[in-house]
């Protein structure tokens, strides 16, 4: 019922590896959901290739993805979010590869934001707080967060703390005195919905106080 590709195009196409991965973001723009897919091989020739999703849609049988440079995406309210959809890479009407995917199992939350660290002198600790847009959402409300921090000079020596709230207390005695720290946070679905880690929030930088020689305690900044 649809267009076609030249035979040569199809023969060339069959030589390539068209494996791809996708993630969904629910209520990412008001009530709109998004679905983003990309080829795993960055060198695949994407000329004349399209992505299509069929099934588990509210209003149409199939939808075509929009291509934006190397990624393909759909932004719509029309995902049923019940059952599996069939996502295919197509040349004209020929499907090169397909995957059956439940969009609720490939959810990538939005990155947390407004990360900040406040030092409490009396308690000798640091209160880490951040925000997430998911607190206001209807679907993906419950998240697990991964807070990662490191001393700035330690390139790859991150300490990770998992938590379900948006507040974390770091004890001063667990940190090096008079040191600059970098901290960041990301989120993953943690109830009914499954999927992937969000992007990291922008990093926040803070300095620990020096040790007060007489008391052995750190000075506030």
């Amino acid at each position: 019922e649809s267009g076609y590709a030249q035979n040569g195009d199809l023969e060339d196409a069959e030589l390539d590896d068209y494996s791809f991965s996708c993630y969904s973001q629910l209520e990412v723009n008001g009530s709109q959901h998004s679905l983003t897919c990309a080829f795993e091989d960055p060198d695949v020739n994407i000329t004349n290739l399209e992505f299509e999703i069929c099934g588990a849609l509210v209003e149409v049988k199939c939808l075509n993805f929009r291509k934006l440079q190397e990624i393909y995406f759909i932004e719509t309210k029309k995902f049923l979010l019940i059952g599996k959809s069939n996502i295919c890479v197509k040349v004209g009407e020929k499907s090169l590869t397909c995957k059956k995917i439940d969009l609720t199992t490939i959810v990538k939350p939005e990155a947390p934001f407004d990360l900040s660290v406040v030092y409490r002198e009396g308690a000798n600790d640091f209160v880490v707080t951040f925000n997430t847009s998911h607190l206001q959402k209807k679907y993906v409300k419950v998240l697990m967060h991964d807070v990662a921090y490191r001393q700035e000079k330690d390139e790859n020596k991150w300490t990770h703390v998992n938590l379900s709230s948006t507040k974390l207390t770091l004890l001063q005695r667990k940190l090096q005195p008079a040191a600059m720290y970098e901290i960041k946070v990301r989120s993953i679905p943690d109830h009914y919905f499954k999927g992937f880690w969000s992007e990291w929030s922008p990093s926040y930088y803070f300095r620990t106080p020096e040790i007060n020689n007489s008391s052995g305690e750190m000075d506030p900044i």
Partner: antibody
């Protein structure tokens, strides 16, 4: 503002050919699926063809499949319908139509041209 | 292929009265239905999409309902400019299809 202007209609003998054009303005053609819809005199609406935003995919009902070809030239802001092996029952006003929603393939139409009349008669 | 059936073919209504138009589909199309109004010598005009979403600029006296295979267009209080032919259209799947139309005429 959005405008769609069809041209190329006229009188043609059965078995003949005709090429309809639709010149569009006021929106980015490459963002939209586009369609041709026809209406025989005194009759209802009949969908004729749809082309995807990229132009890579085309769709037809059985009544015109193999005889009609839809195409587009986004650079020229134009949509086309090549009609071959025309029959008396193809006589109709042919409308070019744009969906309300860009990109994905929701085919309900908020902008229509004024139509161009195709008459197939010997 | 999805077959569209509109009823009645003609509806005679007095101005100010309510008009109810029906559209049935041969298969489940969920909410993939649109309604159009057409006046003589003019192109169709989109009224409703997604079965019940009023298109921008369309008066609130028009409303759509239904899902699956049974759909209704209601005009709550007919105005003189509403006398026209109304078509439903399914866009759930190809081939796209229109109903045969309902002519709303002055009683």
């Amino acid at each position: 503002q959005v405008q769609l202007v069809e041209s190329g209609g006229g009188l043609v003998k059965p078995g003949g050919s005709l090429r309809l054009s639709c010149a569009v303005s006021g929106f980015t053609l490459s963002d939209y699926y586009m369609a041709w819809i026809r209406q025989a005199p005194g009759k209802g609406l009949e969908w004729v063809s749809t082309i995807s935003a990229s132009g890579l995919r085309t769709y037809y009902p059985d009544s015109v499949k193999g005889r009609f070809t839809i195409s587009r030239d986004n650079a020229k802001n134009s949509l086309y319908l090549q009609m071959n092996s025309l029959r008396a029952e193809d006589t109709a006003v042919y409308y070019c139509a744009r969906p309300l929603s860009a990109h994905y393939g929701f085919n309900y139409f908020d902008y229509w041209g004024q139509g161009t009349l195709v008459t197939v008669s010997s | 292929e999805i077959v569209m059936t509109q009823s009645p073919a003609t509806l005679s209504v007095s101005p100010g009265e309510r008009a109810t138009l029906s559209c049935r589909t041969s298969e489940d199309i969920y909410q993939g239905l649109a309604w159009y109004q057409q006046k003589p010598g003019q192109a169709p005009r989109l009224l409703i999409y997604s079965a019940n979403t009023l298109h921008i600029g369309i008066p609130a006296r028009f409303s759509g309902s239904g899902s699956g295979t049974e759909f209704t267009l209601t005009i709550s209080s007919l105005q003189s400019e509403d006398f026209a032919v109304y078509y439903c259209q399914q866009y759930y799947d190809y081939p796209l299809a229109f109903g045969g139309g309902t002519k709303v005429e002055i009683k």
